[in-house]
């Protein structure tokens, strides 16, 4: 098979016919050295998945449930292209499965037992698989057959297509459980009508159902959504209050050697020539031979799935949890309201060792998961492989965009008795230079720069945000002659100054010697002209406070701060000479784990926090000899956030605006995936 050929998998005679037509029409519009289509016919979508995994085919389009099957080992396929619906300007690639209730009712998600339920149909995503999957562990045992367990959980239901003879309670609200529009409560609109008519207390539908059935806002205001955290929100707030986000229809390919760029090139060309209203002789999104062949007839086009987005991220934690519960039928032995151990995400080797020590001292209440970069850790928290970690504000922003929430803030200045309940204003991001140099904020061009890491607040977002507004382009590697900004492209001049050692050169973790606050300052000491760090970095690493060979003889007076007005000041005057105020680092977690993480951490800091005086013979949570492992070493306590419990509120409008502006320069694959 030529390497420019995409072998499309078809699952019926009609699909195979359309595939051949697709192949022939693409041949007529693409150059001979461009991508081509070959057709492979299989008996089912599962056979197609296996064929792609075995390298007998390259691509197929699947519904969400099958994307889950495709991702499971040994298939290991990944989403590469998504169909979108709606307009090109506002493309919809996902819908949200929601639980709708009347505003005048007074129960929450964890109080559904004994209520009456309205479903779109047996085995359907939004109406059955997702809600029942998420409720699975609350269903009465035995949970098999599932229909019986559901019938015993709710006091009455309408589940179109269920067996009314065996499970009469499932048809209590719609006698016979009719499986077509003859049943007034069938499908999305029907399930909503079941709620509207007062037959049921809750309807499991998709987010658009309410808008499609109630054009009038005043009417919509009579309804609310049940959220997984046992609160309610208005029907407009479905993005923050849903049971799961469900991808509509997706092209999958192999994770390794999957030809994803070729598949995208092919489909992008295909939508240009044969997309909606493009051609009379062949239409990608319709067919005379049948409905939804190869692609959905309702699709309007394709979008490339960002490369960082694997199937776990694409399907989302809630969706995977629901489907896994249904498929595997396993539930934790502990009651679900009891906090399980919290899995902390540790960055590379050094943090993992400290985490292991913490785990032992916590008697197993903390467990450890590792990743090589902060973004990989955030992704692990998103998909449930880990639960929490403490992050610099720049990463709190990325984590927030990825659906995580801040849980506790690191406090650096508040003495102990009041610390836990105090909201600090933040720390200062500063630019440090050697006193002997003649540098100012205005003549940094062509100099050597040292950064904590790309994407971090003091080391990147603030200085580069200020620089961007001055130079109006993102080519920071051309502005500085060279530098060390861990996380930059390895061949960039902003990796040139990094120290490594070799395989870890410029990696955004502690294996890179110039990573983090202390690392960026060391970079200035040994090689650089300017370091972008926090205001405490110089005092914490001079005057013998850092015993490492490179730092032990350093004097604070040999360093100065650059002020934005072009002047310079002593490192003792950050309040009058800083680039911006930075939000304190904060612990983040998934919403469903936030309360457990908070409770456990407050308990852990009482045992291992700054009240421990002898860290040589006791475990100390906030100590790692200037390495800032797991938490900043200058943390006094972890403080409650009170109402600052979203990333926007925590970071503040000004900082969010600054980082959002800098997004046009973003090199964050995770941010790209989370905003897809």
């Amino acid at each position: 098979v030529p390497e420019k050929s995409v072998r499309w998998c078809a699952v019926s005679e009609h699909e195979a016919t359309k595939c051949q037509s697709f192949r022939d029409h693409m041949k007529s519009v693409l150059p001979s050295n461009g991508p081509s289509v070959a057709c492979v016919k299989k008996a089912s979508h599962l056979d197609c998945i296996r064929a792609i995994a075995a390298n007998e085919a390259d691509a197929v389009t699947l519904d969400a449930g099958l994307v889950y099957d495709a991702y499971l080992a040994p298939n290991n396929l990944k989403p590469v292209v998504a169909e979108f619906y709606g307009s090109k300007e506002d493309p919809q690639t996902f819908y949200y499965a929601v639980a709708v209730v009347k505003k005048d009712s007074d129960f929450q998600m964890n109080q559904l037992r004994g209520r009456k339920s309205c479903h779109t149909g047996l085995g359907r995503s939004a109406g059955w698989n997702i809600p029942i999957g998420l409720l699975y562990c609350d269903l009465p045992e035995p949970r098999k057959p599932l229909e019986k367990a559901v019938a015993n959980f709710f006091s009455g239901s309408c589940v179109p297509c269920a067996d009314g003879t065996d499970f009469p309670q499932l048809c209590q609200l719609c006698p016979g459980c009719g499986c077509s529009t003859l049943n007034q409560y069938f499908s999305y609109s029907g399930a909503f009508k079941c709620l509207k008519d007062g037959a049921g207390d809750v309807a499991f539908v998709k987010h658009s159902t309410i808008f499609e059935n109630l054009a009038n806002k005043a009417d919509r205001d009579q309804y609310e959504l049940l959220c997984l955290d046992n609160t309610r929100k208005s029907v407009d707030e479905y993005k923050d209050c849903h049971l799961a986000r469900v991808p509509s229809h997706t092209v999958v390919a192999r994770s390794v050697g999957g030809k994803e760029d070729l598949i995208w090139e092919l489909l992008n060309q295909a939508q240009e020539h044969f997309g909606k209203d493009k051609s009379k002789e062949f239409q990608l999104f319709s067919s005379p031979h049948g409905k939804d062949l190869l692609f959905k007839d309702s699709a309007h086009g394709f979008l490339k799935v960002p490369p960082r987005m694997d199937a776990k991220m694409y399907l989302g934690y809630e969706y995977i949890t629901a489907i896994r519960n249904l498929r595997e039928g396993t539930c934790p032995e502990a009651p679900t309201d009891e906090c399980k151990p919290v899995k902390w995400c540790a960055l590379s080797h050094h943090e993992r060792l400290k985490c292991d020590e913490w785990s032992v001292n916590s008697a197993g209440k903390i467990e450890c998961e590792s990743a090589e970069t902060t973004e990989d850790c955030i992704a692990k928290i998103m998909n449930g492989e880990a639960d929490a970690m403490s992050l610099d504000g720049g990463f709190v922003y990325i984590a927030g965009m990825c659906g995580l929430v801040p849980v506790l803030a690191e406090n650096y200045n508040t003495p102990n008795p009041n610390c836990e309940n105090t909201a600090e204003e933040g720390y200062f991001a500063v630019a440090v230079v050697k006193s002997s140099s003649d540098l100012t904020w205005d003549n940094l061009k062509g100099k050597k720069s040292c950064h904590t890491a790309v994407g971090r607040t003091a080391g990147w977002n603030i200085p580069m945000g200020l620089l961007y507004s001055k130079i109006n382009h993102c080519r920071f590697d051309e502005f500085f002659s060279e530098g060390c900004a861990p996380g930059s492209e390895k061949n960039s001049s902003l990796c040139k100054l990094c120290m490594g050692p070799s395989p870890n050169l410029c990696e955004p973790n502690n294996k890179e010697g110039y990573y983090g606050y202390t690392g960026a300052f060391r970079c200035l000491v040994e090689k650089g002209d300017v370091a972008f760090v926090k205001h405490q970095t110089v005092p914490q690493n001079t005057g013998g406070k850092n015993p490492d060979a490179w730092a032990k003889n350093l004097k604070e007076e040999d360093y100065e701060l650059l002020c934005l007005d072009g002047s310079r000041k002593s490192v003792q005057e950050p309040a009058n000479c800083h680039l911006a105020r930075a939000p304190n680092h904060a612990v983040v977690a998934r919403k469903d784990k936030a309360d457990c993480v908070q409770t456990l951490l407050l308990d852990q800091q009482r045992m291992f926090g700054s009240s421990v005086t002898d860290c040589s013979s006791n475990f100390c949570l906030f100590e790692s000899k200037t390495k800032d492992l797991l938490f900043r070493d200058d943390t006094v306590c972890l403080a409650k956030l009170h109402d600052r419990n979203t990333y926007e509120k925590y970071l503040g409008e000004e900082y969010v605006k600054a980082v959002t502006n800098l997004r046009k320069c973003s090199t964050s694959p995770l941010l790209e995936a989370c905003t897809f």
Epitope: K354, E357, V360, N361, C615, N618, C620, K627
Partner: nanobody, 117 residues
């Protein structure tokens, strides 16, 4: 800084037992936490078990009920009693004391445990 030396490894059949020792050149009395790690051929380093100064212990799931960690502060020694050994326990075993707070990259020679019939 305390220097640690591991011993007690060897070849053992599946289901057999071994007792590893970790001897310290200085006093371990004041050391907060000690632990055993292992590295199987071609794999990364993984934590096996840990013990606090007061004697609280914690184990990775796959060794719970089979391995027992203990320490004798008067002899400046930590132990790992390994029972019901399996082929997947084959690895070089290292001990660490965490005491430097640098969470260093420096490990001793370790002691090789081979479980094979």
């Amino acid at each position: 800084e305390v220097q640690l030396v591991e011993s007690g490894g060897g070849l053992v059949q599946p289901g057999g037992s071994l007792r590893l020792s970790c001897a310290a050149s200085g006093s371990i009395f004041s050391i907060a936490t000690m632990a055993w790690y292992r590295q199987a051929p071609g794999k990364g380093l993984e934590w096996v078990a840990g013990i606090t100064r007061s004697g609280s212990t914690n184990y990775r799931d796959s060794v719970k009920g089979r391995f027992t960690i203990s320490r004798d502060n008067s002899k400046n020694t930590m132990y790992l009693q390994m029972n019901s050994l399996r082929a997947e326990d084959t690895a070089v075993y290292y001990c660490t004391d965490y005491s430097s707070r640098y969470y260093h990259d420096y490990w001793g020679q370790g002691t090789l445990v081979t479980v094979s019939s």
